[in-house]
Amino acid sequence: HTAAQDNCTCPTNKMTVCSPDGPGGRCQCRALGSGMAVDCSTLTSKCLLLKARMSAPKNARTLVRPSEHALVDNDGLYDPDCDPEGRFKARQCNQTSVCWCVNSVGVRRTDKGDLSLRCDELVRTHHILIDLRHRPTAGAFNHSDLDAELRRLFRERYRLHPKFVAAVHYEQPTIQIELRQNTSQKAAGDVDIGDAAYYFERDIKGESLFQGRGGLDLRVRGEPLQVERTLIYYLDEIPPKFSMKRLT
């Protein structure tokens, strides 16, 4: 589904402005905040979504142990700089000239510095661990059923190829979804695991980015799967560079 022709909307991103001013009067959608044209047949990049969010009105042990290099997004929201493809620029700075380096999902991976800070390349996040706790149910979910339904969700709703869902772990009430995608594995047209994880995170929070779709209603053999806590860990192809001061 590209931009819907009938009422000219973007099915995959409600944070857009759409108008029939594309070639041949076709519906064309642009992201809020950046004004960049977006492809409504796939997920919009996290960078453009964050930028749009910042521009919007402000009212509204089978389990994996994250490695020592895993990053959690503790800094929260910021207004990012995106490149012409909609990816995060490796260096981000705020209005007070404080700068830092980010990975491909926009999470800070260095100490903060000044305008002299250099970020040589955008380091790819190749492994994302989504850690969920579900609300109590009559009994534990069947692990195989849970695996099947979460894979279906990422495949159907976020269009993420199944090969990038590396594993689904379950120890009631904790569910862990591992997404893996190396630079060499990602082909043109493949959804990025960082974008899929961000859409999932927003769905879980009841802040769906999809146009006109209901919120996430996930059921396993008819039993609702309701998430009460989410933590997302990001692992980069190159470990982050923080000073020892931050680690104490």
Partner: antibody, heavy 117, light 111 residues
Framework: QVQLQESGPGLVKPSQTLKLTCTVS?????????WNWIRQPPGKGLEWIGY???????LYNPSLKSRVTISRDTSKNQFSLKLSSVTAADTAVYYC??????????WGQGTLVTVSS | DIQMTQSPSSLSASVGDRVTITCRAS??????????LHWYQQKPGKAPKLLIY???NLESGVPSRFSGSGSGTDFTLTISSLQPEDFATYYC?????????FGQGTKLEIK
């Protein structure tokens, strides 16, 4: 016991729209699972057409996507298939089936649809 | 799309024989905890009937002479001792990726 039953015209003219309905008993289609259409041309194999989920989400086979619509009427516990611009190649037995966790555990008995003028 | 290839396309056997049908996927249909490969039996004029789900799980009510095995791309359906009612066409189906796809079928006939 879950039961599915297909209904609709057995003969459709070329270029017209094929419309079939599947009536489900023994389970509410909005309570869970995925509700599918599958077809089988005479003497040939099975082809998945698409589904509508318990929450109303659709997924279609890309080979048919431009011509297919699957919808539902929860008040009647029915889901329907519309296939537009049919040709003789769409002649087949059409089955509705329930997808539990990505396999089909309950099937309708099937209905033969012939496309002919 | 994932292509599913069954072999043989047809086979003749006698009551009491042990029969094996194979199904090969063009790419892996397994996850870390699941094998998204299922087997169905179809008799003339009837709807397919689920026999085995997720490669090796016997559907409720299906006789124990049916069994399934395999992972990744190669899977097998075995009937340990053929009964007269087992003569039918058998299909494998993958659900790892959409579109879901079926094998072309294996017709099991009486020798």
């Amino acid at each position: 016991q879950v039961q599915l039953q297909e209904s609709g015209p057995g003969l459709v003219k070329p270029s017209q729209t094929l419309k079939l309905t599947c009536t489900v008993s023994g389970y509410s289609i909005s309570s869970g699972y995925y509700w599918n259409w599958i077809r089988q041309p005479p003497g040939k194999g099975l082809e998945w057409i698409g589904y509508i989920s318990y929450s109303g989400r659709n997924l279609y086979n890309p080979s048919l996507k431009s011509r297919v619509t699957i919808s539902r009427d929860t008040s009647k516990n029915q889901f329907s298939l519309k296939l537009s611009s049919v040709t003789a190649a769409d002649t087949a037995v059409y089955y509705c089936a329930r997808d539990t966790t990505a396999y089909f555990d309950y099937w309708g008995q099937g209905t033969l649809v012939t496309v002919s003028s | 799309d994932i292509q599913m290839t069954q072999s043989p396309s047809s086979l003749s056997a006698s009551v009491g024989d042990r029969v094996t049908i194979t199904c090969r996927a063009s790419e892996s249909v397994s996850s870390s905890v699941n094998r998204f490969l299922h087997w169905y039996q179809q008799k003339p004029g009837k709807a397919p009937k689920l026999l085995i789900y997720r490669a090796s799980n016997l559907e409720s009510g299906v006789p124990s002479r049916f069994s399934g095995s395999g992972s990744g791309t190669d899977f097998t359906l075995t009937i340990s001792s053929l009964q007269p009612e087992d003569f039918a066409t058998y299909y494998c189906q993958q659900s790892n990726e959409d579109p879901y796809t079926f094998g072309q079928g294996t017709k099991l006939e009486i020798k």
